[in-house]
């Protein structure tokens, strides 16, 4: 059976690329190296994905299980208010923000944190799974 999915056989499961983790209905990539926010965004976009946009508290709680004290970039920025890269506002959680110059969002096991965008951090990409290529 596919972990975290409703599919009954592996052959019919949409799959994730190598080094991506399937969780629920999405694929997640947790980086090993560190980059600034913009470079992290570019990395995700180049792989037909986006910097992690969290849809609700449930998804956030599930993902935090895989995180440590180390912060990871996510698709969250402060442009006259904290917004996800899909344009939606941050409304299900609060972000720890201390300074006007900290305009990019990161996550660790304890929650969301604002940071200066050029700090090199790990990052998380998110994408939809694709159907098993062998089926086509």
């Amino acid at each position: 059976l596919c972990q975290g999915s409703n599919y009954s056989t592996c052959a019919s499961c949409p799959s994730c690329p190598d080094r991506w983790m399937k969780y629920g209905n999405h694929c997640y990539y947790f980086s090993v190296e560190e980059k600034d926010w913009n470079s992290s965004l570019e990395f995700c976009l180049a792989r037909d994905s986006h910097l992690l946009v969290i849809t609700d508290n449930q998804e956030m709680s599930l993902l935090q299980v895989f995180l440590s004290e180390a912060f990871c970039w996510i698709g969250l920025r402060n442009n006259s208010g904290w917004r996800w890269e899909d344009g939606s506002p941050l409304n299900f959680s609060r972000i720890s923000s201390n300074s006007f110059v900290q305009t990019c969002g990161a996550i660790n096991k304890n929650g969301l944190q604002a940071s200066s965008c050029e700090v090199p951090l790990h990052w998380v990409c998110k994408k939809c799974p694709f159907a098993d290529q062998a089926l086509f």
């Epitope: 201390n98 660790n108 700090v119």
Partner: antibody, heavy 125, light 112 residues
Framework: QVTLKESGPGLVKPTQTLTLTCTFS??????????VGWIRQPPGKALEWLAH???????WYELALKSRLTISKDSSKNQVVLTMTNMDPVDTATYYC?????????????????WGPGTTVTVSS | DILMTQSPLSLPVTPGEPASISCKSS???????????LEWYLQKPGQSPRLLIY???NRFSGVPDRFSGSGSGTDFTLKISRVEAEDVGVYYC?????????FGAGTKLELK
């Protein structure tokens, strides 16, 4: 609201050790990306960076003064302490503490976005 | 150490008129990450310095839009479009791109 306030002895004798305390509020020095630094300004002269300490206790000092300086923090009390040994009349200055925002380098490139009012230190016998 | 040279050292300005302060670094202060960590601070009489501009051209919170920063490489400028009485004080440029971080000697802005 972020505030910082320096306190110190005001007058120290040559060769003595200066101890300065920066008490702050409105942020936590346990939070990722936060630091507190010390800057001084001799009378009628320009500003000079001395030292700073980061949220994870990483410390950085002005190279020429490194042997005389010690910076430490007590996050629970929201305080940072700077000690400077072997004080000399040329160390007479206004000493400021400032909040420092991390940009990815421990040693450089940061913003000092909030400053304390300063404390005047005179070194004289 | 990188020397930050400000000019002029004294700047008398008529209220309502523009003002411009130059800051030149002895070598490029473009960091290897592509960012330029050049900041401007204002120290009003009897007060501590406060951050006006960070990363060359970004106004800090609460700074009026009559203040603007520009420049690249080694040449930087702070402009005030219309000087007001509350703008009087000493303006310092600061480079944080390379260790040790260094301040300019300051430019004293006063009213004519």
């Amino acid at each position: 609201q972020v505030t910082l306030k320096e306190s110190g002895p005001g007058l120290v004798k040559p060769t003595q050790t200066l101890t300065l305390t920066c008490t702050f509020s409105g942020f936590s020095l346990s939070t990722f990306g936060m630091g507190v630094g010390w800057i001084r300004q001799p009378p009628g002269k320009a500003l000079e960076w001395l030292a700073h300490i980061w949220w994870d206790d990483d410390k950085w000092y002005e190279l020429a003064l490194k042997s005389r300086l010690t910076i430490s923090k007590d996050s629970s009390k929201n305080q940072v302490v700077l000690t400077m040994t072997n004080m000399d009349p040329v160390d007479t200055a206004t000493y400021y503490c400032a909040r420092v925002i991390y940009y990815g380098s421990r040693s450089a490139y940061y913003s000092m976005d909030y400053w304390g009012p300063g404390t005047t230190v005179t070194v004289s016998s | 150490d990188i020397l930050m040279t400000q000019s002029p050292l004294s700047l008398p300005v008529t209220p309502g008129e523009p003002a411009s302060i130059s800051c030149k670094s002895s070598q490029s202060i473009v960091h290897s990450n592509g960012h330029t960590y050049l900041e401007w601070y204002l120290q009003k009489p009897g007060q501590s310095p406060r951050l006006l501009i960070y990363k060359v051209s970004n106004r800090f919170s609460g700074v009026p839009d009559r203040f603007s920063g520009s420049g690249s490489g080694t040449d930087f400028t702070l402009k005030i479009s219309r000087v007001e009485a509350e703008d009087v004080g000493v303006y310092y440029c600061f480079q944080g791109s390379h260790v040790p971080v260094t301040f300019g000697a300051g430019t004293k802005l006063e009213l004519k």
